[in-house]
């Protein structure tokens, strides 16, 4: 008995060939011996089976002695033994229809689990192997699970179902809902305008939800909500914003926040959460603000940074085109009795400058100028 594998929702063509290369009488029946279709001369006739409105043949092939049974929009319950009767012969074909679906939705939040469920006909014992877009292979039986989805899991998953040494391939598009970056740091000089951007790593037709930015200032004992907003069909509308600081928000995606000026009291860490409609859980992106200030008070030139800096960052004070006068892995450095000239305060990581602030030290009889 010939075995043919089919995919739920697809179309399958079961072949039946006569030795005579001409149109002769044929019938396709199911295992209950109920007629599915056949011919009456050059006319196609259909029986009362459940396949009545989904079964067809190719009349153009009848003259060549080919009498296929085409079944459209396959269902799991179409799995059956189909019998073609032609020239006093019976050809039997076993059709096994499989379906592979993702749990509830193919749009999942980062960190959530993906479960792929195989629908199979009774009596079958298929094996399934799936390959993720990043090349990870998972194997299983009726269900396959992947926990802690990552951004790289977005894309087409290719799953192969194996039964009776035959295979059928499924492709499932999975979208992992996440921000492009899990975390970002913005380095600013005191007084500069700060731009925070939260680009999403996916695109969908309609995006609706609500979000909030909580901020933990380095100097503050507790965090506070800086802004809450709604998202409707990719349009952003602010619901509530603090008076200090008074953040501004872009009306379109990507989510964009503007802090009018960087001040030491704002330096710290924020967590932007986005709750999407019809999704359990939230998207998160951490954002950090590091603020630098260079000042001269009497005979002391000081450079300070506030905010979440890594211990390996170097803070230096140097006179322009000269070697660093002071360089420390600390959040404040100073020079006593600095000589006149343009001083640079540098925050760097392995020689790469992250933040720079210049301060002009005038001869001792004048006051300092900050360009």
């Amino acid at each position: 008995k010939k075995v043919v594998l089919g995919k739920k929702g697809d179309t399958v063509e079961l072949t039946c060939t006569a030795s005579q290369k001409k149109s002769i009488q044929f019938h396709w029946k199911n295992s209950n011996q109920i007629k599915i279709l056949g011919n009456q001369g050059s006319f196609l006739t259909k029986g009362p089976s459940k396949l009545n409105d989904r079964a067809d043949s190719r009349r153009s092939l009848w003259d060549q002695g080919n009498f296929p049974l085409i079944i459209k929009n396959l269902k799991i319950e179409d799995s059956d033994t189909y019998i073609c009767e032609v020239e006093d012969q019976k050809e039997e074909v076993q059709l096994l229809v499989f379906g592979l679906t993702a749990n509830s939705d193919t749009h999942l939040l980062q960190g959530q689990s993906l479960t792929l469920t195989l629908e199979s006909p009774p009596g079958s014992s298929p094996s399934v192997q799936c390959r993720s877009p990043r090349g990870k292979n998972i194997q299983g039986g009726k269900t396959l699970s992947v926990s802690q989805l990552e951004l790289q899991d977005s894309g087409t998953w290719t799953c192969t179902v194996l039964q009776n040494q035959k295979k059928v391939e499924f492709k499932i598009d999975i979208v992992v809902l996440a921000f492009q970056k899990a975390s970002s740091i913005v380095y600013k000089k005191e007084g500069e305008q700060v731009e925070f951007s939260f680009p999403l790593a996916f695109t969908v037709e309609k995006l609706t939800g609500s979000g909030e930015l909580w901020w933990q200032a380095e100097r503050a004992s507790s965090s506070k909500s800086w802004i809450t907003f709604d998202l409707k069909n990719k349009e952003v509308s602010v619901k509530r914003v603090t008076q200090d600081p008074k953040l501004q928000m872009g009306k379109k995606l990507p989510l964009h926040l503007t802090l009018p000026q960087a001040l030491p009291q704002y330096a710290g860490s924020g967590n932007l959460t986005l709750a999407l409609e019809a999704k359990t859980g939230k998207l998160h992106q951490e954002v950090n603000l590091v603020v630098m200030r260079a000042t001269q008070l009497q005979k002391n030139l000081t450079c300070e940074v506030w905010g979440p800096t890594s211990p390996k960052l170097m803070l230096s004070l140097k006179l322009e085109n000269k070697e660093a006068k002071v360089s420390k892995r600390e959040k404040a450095v100073w020079v006593l009795n600095p000589e006149a000239g343009m001083w640079q305060c540098l925050l760097s990581d392995s020689g790469q400058v992250l933040l720079e602030s210049n301060i002009k030290v005038l001869p001792t009889w004048s006051t300092p100028v900050q360009p």
Epitope: H27, N32, Q33, I34, K35, Q40, T45, K46, G47, P48, S49, K50, N52, D53
Partner: antibody, heavy 120, light 107 residues
Framework: QVQLQESGPGLVKPSETLSLTCTVS????????WSWIRQPAGKGLEWIGR???????NYNPSLKSRITMSVDTSKNQFSLELSSVTAADTAVYYC??????????????WGQGTTVTVSS | DIQMTQSPSSLSASVGDRVTITCQAS??????LNWYQQKPGKAPKLLIY???NLETGVPSRFSGSGSGTDFTFTISSLQPEDIATYYC?????????FGGGTKVEIK
């Protein structure tokens, strides 16, 4: 044992729409074809059409342009609408369950039938 | 559509008689034929399926035969409770079609 009960007006005016409902009791409406068959007084049986629980239908070509069948699985009911009726549509209307089993396809359960008269 | 022609349209026989009804299809329907019995004021009841198979619970005096286009229904020994109209019905193709019926009466 599954039972079927037809309901609907016994009298319909010419050119109007005949509407009948069949309620399935003591069994599930799922995974069967449900049909309507009519019988004018003293005459033979005429298959009107059938509907599957998924909503897919097959109608008798002679009545196709006037028939609408629907199914409500939550209420265990299926319905027939026959538009633009004439006196020729006067008959006993049966709702029935069609069954497929080995070598058999046909009606295994019938309603008791409801008489519909088309008259002004 | 497949036309089903039943004959005779009515017959009268005595209790114990052998009664034969024929049904002819307008085209080859293999053995896709049912026979139903309908008593006055009642819904039809299945007696024979696939031309010759007796439905469970149906008395063995009822039988059927035939294939292709010509079919026969027989009551080997007519009983008073067999007074009814008998219909053949094809299920080779849709629409399902019935014969015109044969009314059986007792002499």
């Amino acid at each position: 044992q599954v039972q079927l009960q037809e309901s609907g007006p016994g009298l319909v005016k010419p050119s109007e729409t005949l509407s009948l409902t069949c309620t399935v009791s003591n069994g599930s409406i799922s995974d069967y074809y449900w049909s309507w068959i009519r019988q004018p007084a003293g005459k033979g049986l005429e298959w009107i059409g059938r509907i599957y629980t998924s909503g897919s239908t097959n109608y008798n070509p002679s009545l196709k342009s006037r028939i609408t069948m629907s199914v409500d699985t939550s209420k265990n009911q299926f319905s027939l609408e026959l538009s633009s009726v004439t006196a020729a549509d006067t008959a006993v209307y049966y709702c029935a369950r069609e069954l497929e089993r080995y070598y058999f396809y046909g009606v295994d359960v019938w309603g008791q039938g409801t008489t519909v008269t088309v008259s002004s | 559509d497949i036309q089903m022609t039943q004959s005779p349209s009515s017959l009268s026989a005595s209790v114990g008689d052998r009664v034969t009804i024929t049904c002819q299809a307008s085209q080859d329907i293999s053995n896709y034929l049912n026979w139903y019995q309908q008593k006055p004021g009642k819904a039809p009841k299945l007696l024979i399926y696939a031309a010759s198979n007796l439905e469970t619970g149906v008395p063995s005096r009822f039988s059927g035969s035939g294939s292709g286009t010509d079919f026969t229904f027989t009551i080997s020994s007519l009983q008073p409770e067999d007074i009814a109209t008998y219909y053949c019905q094809q299920y080779d193709s849709l629409p399902l079609t019935f014969g015109g019926g044969t009314k059986v009466e007792i002499k």
